[in-house]
């Protein structure tokens, strides 16, 4: 759902043409057009992390970055390369929530993010290569899926304190990256405009050299940039106990087996708890709908069993410094 606009090439002024005011005033709209050429493509982000507490558990965070309203969210998991997957929970904004063992609690965190807790009986080894997928549907626009998994080397019983490190999720990094390029482009454009201040203004016209002029692509600052600073999230504390899947899941379980320890969920704390807390050295795998994957070590907040909605306690300053963890 990305819209594109063709940006006309800047041609040198034709001989004999003066840089009239009429021509000069055309420059500003085009500069502005390059800034807001496109609307952001909806994307889904997922973060998976294993908790290291008495019981075994995964923490997964999923969210939808897009303007459309969500009509359905499906959370699933399975083995590597799409092997032996099954649905864990389905969340419908109007018709309710369905979940299947070992899912313990599915919930909406915000209008564009969900939370799910999966817990088992506490085994010692992590689920190697387990993949978790979140699929967000926005009717009638379409649906988008992102998947995340723990690196096989993840150690739930890490005793050494993790090293804090600033993290940017893949989707936010993408937005900021494009914004940076845009900003640079704008500054450069303004620089060129100042250089040609006392010369005849260049005449704007579509390029005749190629049938398709270069296309400028960018996130609309008014929409995407704000979304980046108010990223909703969902936390899924999931424990890998697929043994319960075949017996309890009405749709039949996967053919693969693995085990993960789970932990007791804690209730969310106030903003102060986000201030300066360590982030695991070995992080989760973040995936974005377009297939970009980035390692992230952010530790998501623990969510309690309650169904009360709460916004991101960090507010609009969420991008400052390392993402907080308890």
């Amino acid at each position: 759902m990305r819209t594109e606009a063709q940006v006309p090439a800047l041609q040198p002024p034709e001989p004999g043409l003066e840089g009239a005011m009429g021509h000069r005033t055309l420059v500003l709209p085009w500069v502005l057009l390059t800034l807001c050429v496109t609307a952001g493509t909806p994307e889904v982000w997922v973060q998976v992390r294993m908790e290291a507490t008495e019981l075994s558990s995964f923490t997964i965070r999923c969210g939808f970055l897009g303007s459309g309203s969500i009509s359905l969210v499906t959370v699933s998991w399975g083995g590597p390369n799409g092997a032996g997957g099954t649905t864990l929970a389905v969340l419908h904004p109007e018709r309710g929530i369905r979940q299947w063992a070992p899912a313990r609690q599915a919930r909406w965190e915000t209008q564009s993010s969900i939370s799910l807790i999966l817990e088992g009986s506490g085994a010692s080894s992590p689920c190697a290569n387990t993949t978790f997928c979140c699929k967000f549907a926005s009717f009638p626009e379409g649906s988008w899926e992102a998947c995340g998994s723990l690196p096989p080397s993840s150690d739930p019983g890490l005793s050494a304190p993790p090293t804090p490190a600033p993290i940017l999720r893949a989707d936010l990094a993408g937005i900021l990256g494009v914004s940076g390029v845009l900003l640079f482009g704008c500054v450069y454009l303004l620089h060129l405009l100042r250089r040609h201040k006392h010369r005849p203004a260049p005449r704007l016209q579509p390029s005749r050299t190629s049938p398709q002029a270069p296309r400028a692509r960018a996130w609309a600052p008014s929409q995407a940039s704000q979304a980046a600073l108010h990223v909703p999230y969902a936390t899924i504390n999931t424990s890998c106990r697929p043994a319960t899947l075949d017996t309890a899941h009405p749709h039949g379980g996967p053919s693969w087996w693995a085990s993960l320890p789970t932990h007791a969920a804690h209730r969310p704390q106030g903003p102060a708890a986000w201030a300066s807390t360590p982030i695991p050295a070995r992080g989760s795998f973040v995936s974005v709908e377009n297939g970009l994957y980035a390692q992230a070590g952010e530790r998501p907040p623990h969510t309690g069993p309650g169904l009360t909605l709460f916004p991101d306690p960090r507010g609009p300053r969420a991008m400052e410094g390392p993402l907080g963890v308890r």
Epitope: L72, A83, G85, T86, T131, P140, W144, E145, H251
Partner: nanobody, 127 residues
Framework: EVQLVESGGGLVQPGGSLRLSCAAS????????MSWVRQAPGKGLEWVST????????SYVDSVKGRFTISRDNSKNTLYLQMNSLRAEDTAVYYC????????????????????WGQGTMVTVSS
């Protein structure tokens, strides 16, 4: 972006057969239950059949039991619906959808109740 593309529809005589296909892309097909739903002219959306993620369980609406067979090939990311002994009342637009409508009940079904949906393929049974 997730895409579901149905094919195989067409005009067939009563008692004839058709095989619908649904090619899926943009998501981990093998992790999800898939269904076929249909909408007859002037009618609401009706569930037809569902198959779970590993093809270990299938279910059908009573009116098609013994005539329709749902299947999937996870290696090809494709869902199928083999329709035999077709009747005039099977005339409808058939949609491939992700999800099981039984999750929230079959009443007042809408495409928005599913995680993904295709554009539909028309099946006309007429002599």
């Amino acid at each position: 972006e997730v895409q579901l593309v149905e094919s195989g529809g067409g005009l067939v005589q009563p008692g004839g057969s058709l095989r619908l296909s649904c090619a899926a892309s943009g998501f981990t097909f093998s992790y999800y239950d898939m269904s076929w739903v249909r909408q007859a002219p002037g009618k609401g959306l009706e569930w037809v059949s569902t198959i779970n993620s590993n093809a270990g369980r299938t279910s059908y609406v009573d009116s098609v039991k013994g005539r329709f067979t749902i299947s999937r090939d996870n290696s090809k990311n494709t869902l199928y619906l083999q329709m035999n002994s077709l009747r005039a009342e099977d005339t409808a637009v058939y949609y491939c959808v992700e999800g099981d409508p039984h999750n929230f009940g079959l009443e007042s079904l809408s495409l928005r109740d599913f995680g993904s949906w295709g554009q539909g393929t028309m099946v006309t049974v007429s002599s």
